[in-house]
Interface confidence: low
Amino acid sequence: IWELKKDVYVVELDWYPDAPGEMVVLTCDTPEEDGITWTLDQSSEVLGSGKTLTIQVKEFGDAGQYTCHKGGEVLSHSLLLLHKKEDGIWSTDILKDQKEPKNKTFLRCEAKNYSGRFTCWWLTTISTDLTFSVKSSRGSSDPQGVTCGAATLSAERVRGDNKEYEYSVECQEDSACPAAEESLPIEVMVDAVHKLKYENYTSSFFIRDIIKPDPPKNLQLKPLKNSRQVEVSWEYPDTWSTPHSYFSLTFCVQVQGKSKREKKDRVFTDKTSATVICRKNASISVRAQDRYYSSSWSEWASVPCS
Amino acid sequence: RAVPGGSSPAWTQCQQLSQKLCTLAWSAHPLVGHMDLREEGDEETTNDVPHIQCGDGCDPQGLRDNSQFCLQRIHQGLIFYEKLLGSDIFTGEPSLLPDSPVAQLHASLLGLSQLLQPEGHHWETQQIPSLSPSQPWQRLLLRFKILRSLQAFVAVAARVFAHGAATLSP
């Protein structure tokens, strides 16, 4: 058993049929010694008396808010949550496996630049009685500070018969150094509580590996005289790190016909313009990637040829 | 070339070669699918590699103030990785093809380090830890780790030279 926060405790249980469970001793936070009784949740049934209460925690029915009283007055509370371990593996019932980029990916994180700011998100099908708490640091043995906001519900989707809820959190490294080469990874820890079930999820990454620039902005076409060619121009996204002479992007320009089956023409360039042939009913798209490190490409920015 | 006393390197040449290094580092060990989640892995072996850290003056402001600190750090790293790629970690079994990207990477590291430091002038270089294991498969693991670290190192070096070529070239 360990303390998650004041008056909230997590009991770690090996979860299998007829498991013995864990013996837990609760102590009433009071100077009083006599006349103390204990109850669980809203029940008025007295579970025991005395300053301490010893219970055998085996299942969710044994978890909940234990309260000690004296003469009708509440003295203190202890909320017990359960963390299940089945076949040596901690349960992951609360969050959905996103399976990208690999199985058992519950948290996904992205950064738009090297400022030390990043966003993580996760999915669940649970709609109520759900709380999340997020902590982060750079490195684990001698951790350096990363500040995370509160996790918020950022999207709802219908997937077949189920509703899926996306939560996200923004974090910022306290003393970010955008130009340095990272040697210690960022660690992100999410505590999830659903009713009386506790679970924790972690992710570890270098910012450079989760970089995904925003799409290029101000994508424009300028027809060239007496030619089917057009000059495509664009600008770095506002959210990208500056100066651009240092934090450079490379770009991919694609000409795509109306039909997905039509051959795509692609040009790669470090410049912010390119000359391409604009076919009728085609569209021109541009995306960006860090010029010197192969992290993710941005989403496409597109304009129609016409 | 960086001349003793601190005159400027050939920024544009360094920019071109460092960008080539980035390309080669990724072709030597391409992205097999980016992993967010950390799993098992003994990490002691590449913690000794030189990193370009916050106080090394490799940020745009530091380069403007005095690029020599940063260039010295980059030079140290280039020599370090050049020695690693020339060591039996990469030359021993299991053997790589002579024209593999690793061989080209090795030559380019040497080329860039020579651009930064002419003969006869010696910056202090970092001692290479005795990493080389006798077993071929352990060499294989080290290759993975070294190339991943090198990709991060040359990315920062390439940014430095790109910025220098754009803003500090005479």
Partner: antibody
Amino acid sequence: QVELVQSGAEVKKPGSSVKVSCKASGGTFSSNYISWVRQAPGQGLEWMGINAHLGGTWYAQKFQGRVTITADESTSTAYMELSSLRSEDTAVYYCARSKKGMYGGWTYPLMMFDLWGQGTLVTVSS
Amino acid sequence: DIVLTQSPATLSLSPGERATLSCRASQSVSSNYLAWYQQKPGQAPRLLIYYASRRATGVPARFSGSGSGTDFTLTISSLEPEDFATYYCQQTSNTPFTFGQGTKVEIK
């Protein structure tokens, strides 16, 4: 879920060769980490060799010159060919995938085998 | 080559009993490079423990590994009927990767 599916049992004459295949189905395939292990009837396990990224292929000294391990990424299939067969090569041959470890977010093989094919019995008899 | 010697060759126990299997190496093996497998007749081996003490995915908590240098142990705290099988240790410190000759855990 990834599965390694091996080719069927073979009966071979002494002096001939056998080629066993191992196809990955239901997930991404990395031939870079496929090892071959054999087990003679009633005996223990014996590692033969591996196909490894950043280092081609290498073999246990005992099989050097007789075994060839290859892979075809396009069909997600690894192959093990053993030549100059003798009666003591009668065994079940397994392909096995190395468990992957991580370094700073990148995978590499640990050479401990977390996924195995069902095995292919090769009988060498005149 | 590193030779791994497992003992005992056979272990006769009843369900619920504790099983202790030993694996001794002819030269020192980094604990990062020792694994244990379980094999049942007619089946492929299954990875139980790697890094000498870390349980592989889905392996029950009753299995645990320990040891370093040349002496390693696999412990099954309370035998279940499905645990009766042959167990192999494997080192991946040096090539060729070698396996022990196996310990058969049978029902008494």
